[in-house]
């Protein structure tokens, strides 16, 4: 806490300007009116205040707005935002996307801090859902943002927002998240033609079921190995050798390099060796000729 002391004669601040950087902490506390500071917040960022001075300015705003800052002040916080705690931010009501952008800009280039996470949480909850503009903004600043959400939170993303998602935004998503996002993407892109559709849906395919992969195999999509390796193992296992060959097109040769890795390894174990041999890739580990394949999962279902 900064002690309350009278402002020395002639030092009362009439505006927020460069002269204040020479004020000691107690002088800032005594000589800067909190209401003046609130109305001229945009100037604070234009002045190279020190850490300690910024602490005093924050303290003055906290005293003026004990219930939380109004959006008119929040929008102009600039670098003072980095002084805020998650507890401070939970008191705010941020509704403007412009305010959100202004504060995210301050943290640009850094990892998502607890302050930013709290700010985004407050903003999204206030809006009720992750609309396209918000998602556009958040993924522009934090490409990994979508993948930081739980499947439950992702369920509030409307399919229309999926258009804002770029492939790199999904890099760190796990299968559970892609399971939620894939049906939304399928819905969002449903009116696109074959090749355009595949380009858009490709990065979401880690959530695709077997029947959708079978359908894609009929469309000459030439899926690359990197995408294939991200598919759900349980979705790949039922695919026949012919279907995988059609799905991958010229990329099928890449299976050899991946034969020890999932899902390729597990898929090979489910295929007849004769069928694998038709690929001419030297894939080994299939079911030997003459062996009977029992689908135990079907048997369990019947009993």
């Amino acid at each position: 806490e900064v002690e309350k002391t009278a402002c020395p004669s002639g030092k009362k601040a009439r505006e927020i300007d460069e002269s204040l950087i020479f004020y000691k902490k107690w002088e800032l506390e005594a000589c800067v009116d909190a209401a003046l500071l609130a109305t001229q917040m945009d100037r604070v960022n234009a002045i190279p205040f020190t850490y300690e001075q910024l602490d005093v300015l924050k303290h003055k705003l906290d005293e003026l707005y004990p219930q939380g800052y109004p959006e008119s002040v929040i929008q102009h916080l600039g670098y003072l935002f980095l002084k805020m705690s998650p507890e401070d931010i939970r008191k705010w009501n941020v509704t403007s996307l412009e305010t959100l952008k202004a504060l995210l800009e301050v943290n640009k280039g850094h990892e998502m801090s607890p302050q930013v996470a709290t700010l985004i949480d407050r903003f999204v909850k206030g809006r009720g859902q992750l609309d396209k503009d918000t998602l556009d903004t958040l993924t522009a600043f934090y490409p990994g943002y979508l993948c930081s959400l739980s499947p439950e939170e992702l369920s509030s993303v409307p399919p229309s927002s999926i258009w804002a998602v770029r492939p790199q935004d999904l890099d760190t998503c796990d299968p559970r998240q892609l399971d939620v996002l894939y049906p939304k993407a399928r819905l969002a892109f449903q009116n696109m033609n074959g090749s355009e559709y595949f380009v858009k849906i490709q990065s979401f395919l880690g959530g695709a079921p077997t029947e959708d992969l079978k359908a894609l195999s009929q469309q000459n999509v030439s899926m690359d190995l990197a995408t294939f390796m991200k598919l759900r193992t349980d979705a790949v296992l039922p695919l026949t050798v012919a279907e995988v060959q059609k799905l991958l097109g010229p990329h099928v040769e890449g299976l050899k390099a991946e034969e020890r890795h999932r899902p390729v390894r597990d898929w090979i174990l489910r295929q007849r060796q004769d069928d694998l041999d038709t690929l001419g890739l030297g894939l080994q580990g299939g079911i030997p000729n003459g062996y009977l394949v029992l689908d135990l999962s079907m048997q369990e279902a019947l009993s």
């Epitope: 950087i21 190279p48 020190t50 850490y51 300690e52 001075q53």
Partner: antibody, heavy 122, light 107 residues
Framework: QVQLVQSGAEVKKSGESLKISCKGS????????IAWVRQMPGKGLEWMGI????????IYSPYFQGQVTISADKSISTAYLQWSSLKASDTAMYYC???????????????WGQGTTVTVSS | DIRLTQSPSSLSASLGDRVTITCRAS??????LAWYQQKPGKAPRLLIY???TLESGVPSRFSGSGSGTDFTLTISSLQPEDFATYYC?????????FGGGTKLEIK
């Protein structure tokens, strides 16, 4: 790459005027403060003042206020330090340095010019 | 103004030595302190800021510590290129001030 390039060495007589320059490149020159720092022969570093080229706001150290003028021309990414009447005691190495800028309360000098030697004879 | 006192003012050491330079502020400055290296005829170079954060590109043998009034710069194992003069600078309040420097020489 990010750099500050200063004008060459100057030899002057007492009472003459002088303007030395510092040209920035490789970054948004208008978005960072530029500082001037003096180093007298065999001595330490002294902060003289800073300028924000974006709008030419200047903050002088109380010890150099009225002794020098700091200015900038954002259009050519150049900051200046000038004297209207040099004294022998102005003999020193003068450095420009990038200061703070759009980072939070970063009041240190991360990029430096190579320095300009000013020699003033009486 | 905040005065910074560096000690020692000069220091002789050998290659591979561990060296510590101290900087004492005339009043508490939190962690608002930077360290610079200056070689003869060259401009200073930022090594450490915020008392302990290594500037990018600076070798990890350099480290900084301290807060309040007492700070240290440590070089864990001296290399030939480390012989120079080192300055501390406070960023807690204006006017910004530097320490008087510590000249590190080869023994």
């Amino acid at each position: 790459q990010v750099q500050l390039v200063q004008s060459g060495a100057e030899v002057k007589k007492s009472g003459e005027s002088l303007k030395i320059s510092c040209k920035g490149s490789g970054y948004g020159f208008g978005a960072y403060w530029i500082a001037w720092v003096r180093q007298m022969p065999g001595k330490g570093l002294e902060w003289m003042g800073i300028i924000y080229p974006g709008d030419s706001r200047v903050i002088y150290s109380p010890y150099f206020q009225g002794q020098v003028t700091i200015s900038a021309d954002k259009s050519i990414s150049t900051a200046y330090l000038q004297w209207s009447s040099l004294k022998a005691s102005d003999t020193a190495m003068y450095y420009c340095a990038r200061f703070g800028g759009p980072k939070f309360a970063t009041n240190w000098f991360d990029i430096w010019g190579q320095g300009t030697t000013v020699t003033v004879s009486s | 103004d905040i005065r910074l006192t560096q000690s020692p003012s000069s220091l002789s050491a050998s290659l591979g030595d561990r060296v510590t330079i101290t900087c004492r502020a005339s009043q508490a400055i939190s962690s608002a302190l930077a360290w610079y290296q200056q070689k003869p005829g060259k401009a200073p170079r930022l090594l450490i800021y915020d008392a302990s954060t290594l500037e990018s590109g600076v070798p990890s043998r350099f480290s900084g510590s301290g807060s309040g009034t007492d700070f240290t710069l440590t070089i864990s194992s001296l290399q030939p290129e480390d012989f120079a003069t080192y300055y501390c600078q406070q960023a807690d309040s204006f006017p910004l001030t530097f320490g008087g420097g510590t000249k590190l020489e080869i023994k």
